[in-house]
Interface confidence: low
């Protein structure tokens, strides 16, 4: 189809080569087309469209993005050519950064149902750059935390080195939708809830003598408990002898309950003590069996091919540890009788 | 069909207490929406009472002169909203609607209950 | 709290003729408004949101204009089941809750 008859927006990416980070682009479809094809009245007397950035009603999904080769080639369907970019209705997800991400995607609606809609298109010019500007070491990072129950910020990355004052008007989205009231480099959350969470999107305008561009970045934010002042407790095993039948296989299970903490570092082993020697047991990897905000349940177990006489004198110790402290549970093996 | 019903409202007494009810049918009280109360004294316009966030968190917001008097409740499992009303006062004779408001930029109240009506009277 | 004050307050008007009632907003709202319609005994209806979008179900002859502070709602001709009161109403919402502010109304009756 004919592209010169859509409208064009231009986007900048500047990304940071020291973390992930991804992008997204909105189906923003003009206007005059947005209400004509957009808003079709598909809907029951009882509903109403959401506001959103871009589509709005029944139609979320009934568009196409295609890329643009830079050689003139003909427009290649994103879902066919490009796996590290998704489609989640009218939003183009890039999961991975990257300067190949240049270039030109357009989005249409896929039913033209007149003649009306064969313009009913937007083109946007998307430059991907690398971050070069070393003076602001300590840009806001694409994933931020609230922590729940207190109030918190949550920062527009490509901005944070600016203050408040200095920074240009913001458009803010949260998971798509325009956030009408937020305009500044900063939104100042009054009291953190589980809602909070999601991914943010935030635009402004940067201009030179030759044109202008919606500079934008996205921001995961996650919403946290306050980190545990608790050492993690062990639920499994409990008893600290356990009956067995010697020459049969064994596997013991050490469950832990580990409490909610950012920087999550959390520690299961198992260990022998014979006599006077102790040494660390080389056990199948740690699995998390349950994860909730507050806290997270972790096992990890040990394998006895057979159970020998030997066994019956060693203590097995599981050992967890998290930045508070360690707890330890110890298990001697006795022989099953009759 | 997706609705809301009140009821509740009552003749009492200055000084005394009500609750009123609200069933949401066709939907659920558990997702990305607010529900809220509004009122309308007799003969007035409408104004903003209390709103419940549906989400797991509940939370709650209340206009500056319903804080301490009027709490804002919600059972999922009886997909019930409730307004209590402490302390009531003549000027709080009017009809209460529940209705519900989808957070999104440019929301509206699209959805609204008959009305039931409290009057406080001695 | 955004404050909005709607005028006139009542309107006496004919069938036929063009009506229209303002609401303004203490502070910039963009285009997050609504107006509602009430007739004597129901619950309000939506006509407008977005400022100048149309509800599903509601008649053309109704639209709605305006953005920043200053907002317009205009019955182009208007029927013998427009005579009711108007309310116009706030719609923001940010990442904090925003109390959704009604005007005062507009009382639409027979001259």
């Known amino acids: 189809f004919n592209i010169s008859g859509c409208s064009t927006k231009k986007l900048l990416w500047t990304y940071s080569t020291r973390s992930e980070e991804e992008f997204v682009l909105f189906c923003d479809l003009p206007e005059p087309q947005k209400s004509h094809f957009c808003h079709r009245n598909r809907l029951s007397p009882k509903q109403v469209p959401e506001h959103l950035p871009f589509m709005g009603s029944n139609d979320l999904s009934d568009v196409q993005w295609y890329q643009q080769p830079s050689n003139g080639d003909p427009l290649e369907d994103i879902r066919k050519s490009y796996p590290h970019i998704i489609q989640d209705k009218c939003t183009l997800h890039f999961l991975t950064p990257g300067v190949n991400n240049s270039g030109s995607y357009i989005c249409r609606p896929k039913m033209i149902k007149s003649p009306y809609d064969v313009a009913c298109c937007v083109k946007m010019i998307l430059e991907v750059k690398p971050q070069t500007n070393a003076s602001c070491e300590y840009s806001a990072s694409h994933k931020q935390d609230l922590l729940l129950g207190s109030t918190g910020s949550i920062s527009c990355p490509s901005l944070s080195c600016q203050s408040d004052a200095q920074s240009p008007a913001v458009t803010w989205y949260k998971n798509g939708k325009l956030l009408s009231v937020e305009r500044s480099n900063r939104i100042v959350v009054d009291e953190v809830y589980d809602y909070h969470q999601g991914t943010y999107v935030c635009d402004y305008t940067q201009s030179d003598t030759v044109s202008s561009w919606t500079v934008r970045a996205v921001v995961q934010v996650r919403t946290i408990v306050g980190d545990t002042k608790l050492k993690p407790d062990i639920l499994d095993p409990v008893e600290d002898t356990l009956e067995v039948e010697l020459g049969k296989p064994l596997t013991i299970s050490c469950k832990a309950r580990f409490g909610f903490e950012r920087v999550f570092n959390p520690v299961i082993k198992w260990y022998i003590k014979d006599s006077d020697l102790e040494w660390e047991v080389s056990v199948p990897e740690a699995k998390s069996i349950k994860s909730t905000l507050k806290d997270e349940i972790i096992e990890r177990n040990i394998i006895l091919e057979k159970v020998t006489q030997r066994d019956l004198r060693r203590k097995f110790v599981c050992f967890v540890q998290n930045s508070i402290g360690n707890t330890t549970q110890s298990v001697q093996l006795k022989e099953k009788r009759g | 069909e997706v609705q809301l019903e009140e009821s509740g409202g009552d003749l009492v007494q200055p000084g005394g207490s009500l609750r009123l009810s609200c069933a949401a049918s066709g939907f659920s009280f558990n997702g990305n929406y607010y529900i809220c109360w509004v009122r309308q004294a007799p003969g007035k316009g409408l104004e903003w009472v209390a709103c419940i966030y549906a989400g797991s968190s509940g939370s709650t917001y209340y206009a500056s002169w319903a804080k301490g008097r009027f709490t804002i409740s919600r059972d999922t499992s009886k997909n019930t909203l409730y307004l209590q009303m402490n302390s009531l006062r003549a000027e709080d004779t009017a009809v209460y609607f529940c209705?519900?408001?989808?957070?999104?930029?440019?929301?509206?109240?699209?959805?609204w209950g008959q009305g039931t009506l409290v009057t406080v009277s001695s | 709290d955004i404050q909005m004050t709607q005028s006139p307050s009542s309107l006496s008007a004919s069938v036929g003729d063009r009506v229209t009632i303002t609401c303004q907003a203490s502070?910039?709202?963009?285009?997050?408004l609504a107006w509602y319609q009430q007739k004597p005994g129901q619950a309000p209806k939506l006509l407008i949101y977005?400022?100048?979008k149309l509800a599903s179900g509601v008649p053309s002859r109704f639209s709605g204009s305006g953005s920043g502070t200053d907002f317009t709602l205009t019955i182009s001709s208007l029927q013998p089941e427009d005579f009711a009161t108007y309310y116009c109403q706030s719609t923001l919402y940010g990442v904090n809750f925003v109390p959704n502010v009604f005007g005062g109304g507009t009382k639409v009756v027979i001259k």
């Open positions: 977005q400022a100048s």
């Open positions: 209705v519900r408001d989808k957070p999104a930029g440019g929301s509206s109240y699209t959805l």
């Open positions: 502070e910039d709202i963009e285009s997050y």
